[in-house]
Interface confidence: low
């Protein structure tokens, strides 16, 4: 009679995490008598997965009725597979005795576990940066298997090319992580921009995972200032405005200086938003020129988002405005932003 063979028909089996794996094993003879055991790995450190004769293996069930006397199918199903279950599984026939002795092993079935990558997490720099500067974004995703993975970076739908990606660990592992760093050059129009990290993996069936970062959290667009003198509103009154344009974020404080002395400080509140996401704001002063003998230097000083102040000045020519006879006192304030100069 032909000697018993242990047949494991599948060289490899691939299963998604959370599913059940069926590992096939049949024997060609009922002789010699003795139990079947399943192991993960070979050699002295192998791990017992199932013993037909005894033991408690809650995740393992037999596919056929292995207790029947004539049964020659010893396939098993392992439930709720995780990446940690990956490895080569051997179906081993033992000869009955005291103790039982190993008789013959199957060739082994390699179980690989497909585990989805976690949602990519994109993080930007800790501090804001201004246009024309290059900033770094990182993208991380974890827990996937197999190791093969593709990562792409986009800015507003345009693929980026300046990035470096690593998959860890380099050697064999039950699951893997990917870490990528992309460099992005900021422009003044980037308040509404998004940086996207896209991860493609065999487990995702062609539907990649994406992580995003809004550049509004990264960019600081410094304001441009313009101080202008408006036409005379009433006799001897000049309206001076400070236009603060194209700034982001909104946090801004403006100080008016008259000949270097602080006149008024205010915080940007009722700003207008531009299409590109930046803001504009305007502050104004009403100056009673009749109260002045000399020219006045008006300075609009702006502190934006905690940065060093920027300023713009305007020289108000008092001599160009005829003074009213006997008018030695300044006119009353006529608005929240009006200012009389003494």
């Amino acid at each position: 009679e032909e000697e018993l063979q242990v047949i494991q028909p599948d060289k490899s089996v691939s299963v998604a995490a959370g599913e059940s794996a069926i590992l096939h094993c049949t024997v060609t003879s009922l002789i010699p008598v003795g139990p079947i055991q399943w192991f993960r790995g070979a050699g002295p450190a192998r791990e017992l997965i199932y013993n037909q004769k005894e033991g408690h293996f809650p995740r393992v069930t037999t596919v056929s009725e292995s207790t029947k006397r004539e049964n020659m199918d010893f396939s098993i199903s392992i439930s709720n597979i995780t990446p940690a279950d990956a490895g080569t599984y051997y179906c081993v026939k033992f000869r009955k005795g005291s103790p039982d002795t190993e008789f013959k092993s199957g060739a082994g079935t390699e179980l690989s576990v497909r585990a989805k990558p976690s949602a990519p997490v994109v993080s930007g720099p800790a501090a804001r940066a201004t246009p024309q500067h290059t900033v770094s974004f990182t993208c991380e995703s974890h827990g996937f298997s197999p190791r093969d993975i593709t990562l792409k970076w986009f800015k507003n739908g345009n693929e980026l090319s300046d990035f470096q990606t690593n998959v860890d660990p380099v050697g064999e592992s039950v699951s893997y992580s990917i870490h990528s760093t992309a460099k992005v050059v900021l422009t003044r129009e980037d308040v509404h921009s998004q940086v996207i990290c896209e991860v493609a993996h065999v487990t995702l069936q062609g539907d990649p995972l994406r992580g995003t970062a809004n550049l509004s959290e990264t960019i600081r667009v410094p304001p441009t200032l313009e101080v202008t003198q408006q036409p005379v509103r009433a006799e001897n009154q000049v309206n001076v405005t400070c236009q603060v344009r194209k700034f982001y974020p909104q946090r801004l404080q403006l100080t008016w200086l008259e000949n270097g002395n602080v006149s008024r400080t205010e915080t940007a509140s009722t700003v207008t938003e531009n299409k590109d996401g930046t803001y504009n704001w305007m502050s104004w002063l009403l100056v009673n020129v009749s109260a002045h003998r000399d020219d006045v230097k008006l300075t609009c000083q702006v502190e934006h988002d905690g940065q060093p102040a920027v300023s713009k000045s305007h020289d108000l020519k008092v001599s160009a405005h005829p003074k009213e006879q006997g008018s030695n006192t300044a006119a009353e304030n006529t608005g929240s932003n009006e200012r009389n100069i003494y």
């Epitope: 197999p146 190791r147 093969d148 993975i149 593709t150 990562l151 792409k152 970076w153 693929e159 980026l160 090319s161 300046d162 990035f163 470096q164 990606t165 690593n166 998959v167 380099v170 050697g171 064999e172 990528s180 493609a200 993996h201 065999v202």
Partner: nanobody
Framework: HVQLVESGGGLVQVGDSLRLSCAPS????????MAWFRQAPGKEREFVAA????????SYKDSVKGRFTISRDNARNTFYLQMNSLEPQDTGVYYC????????????????????WGQGTPVTVSS
């Protein structure tokens, strides 16, 4: 250490076909991408074709598009370059290269992206 072993090169006539093979040996190895480069006598090494291990659309040098096909056999752990309608300008030493982790956008045409290289297999196309 990983070694890449190429085979399949040889002397052929114009219009003939060849299939090059590349088999990583050493430790169990999975790359992000595999590529073929070539170097003609007296010229710089140039990109020919690349494919991701995970699959997707391969990338080719313009002059070989439609004639060359890069493919992989994951079960055999082997990569191939099927070269049809060979021309004299296809002559050179063909190198297999492996990019272990992704170094840039898409499939790298830059040899500096590749971590491992084979010794090369010569292909001569005579007219």
């Amino acid at each position: 250490h990983v070694q890449l072993v190429e085979s399949g090169g040889g002397l052929v006539q114009v219009g003939d076909s060849l299939r090059l093979s590349c088999a990583p040996s050493g430790r169990t190895f999975r790359a992000y991408a595999m590529a073929w480069f070539r170097q003609a006598p007296g010229k710089e090494r140039e990109f020919v074709a690349a494919i991701r291990w995970i699959g997707g659309t391969p990338s080719y040098k313009d002059s070989v598009k439609g004639r060359f096909t890069i493919s992989r056999d994951n079960a055999r752990n082997t990569f191939y370059l099927q070269m049809n309608s060979l021309e004299p300008q296809d002559t050179g030493v063909y190198y297999c290269a492996a990019e272990e982790t992704q170094k840039g956008s898409g499939l790298g045409h830059d040899g500096r992206h590749y971590d491992y290289w084979g010794q090369g297999t010569p292909v001569t196309v005579s007219s």
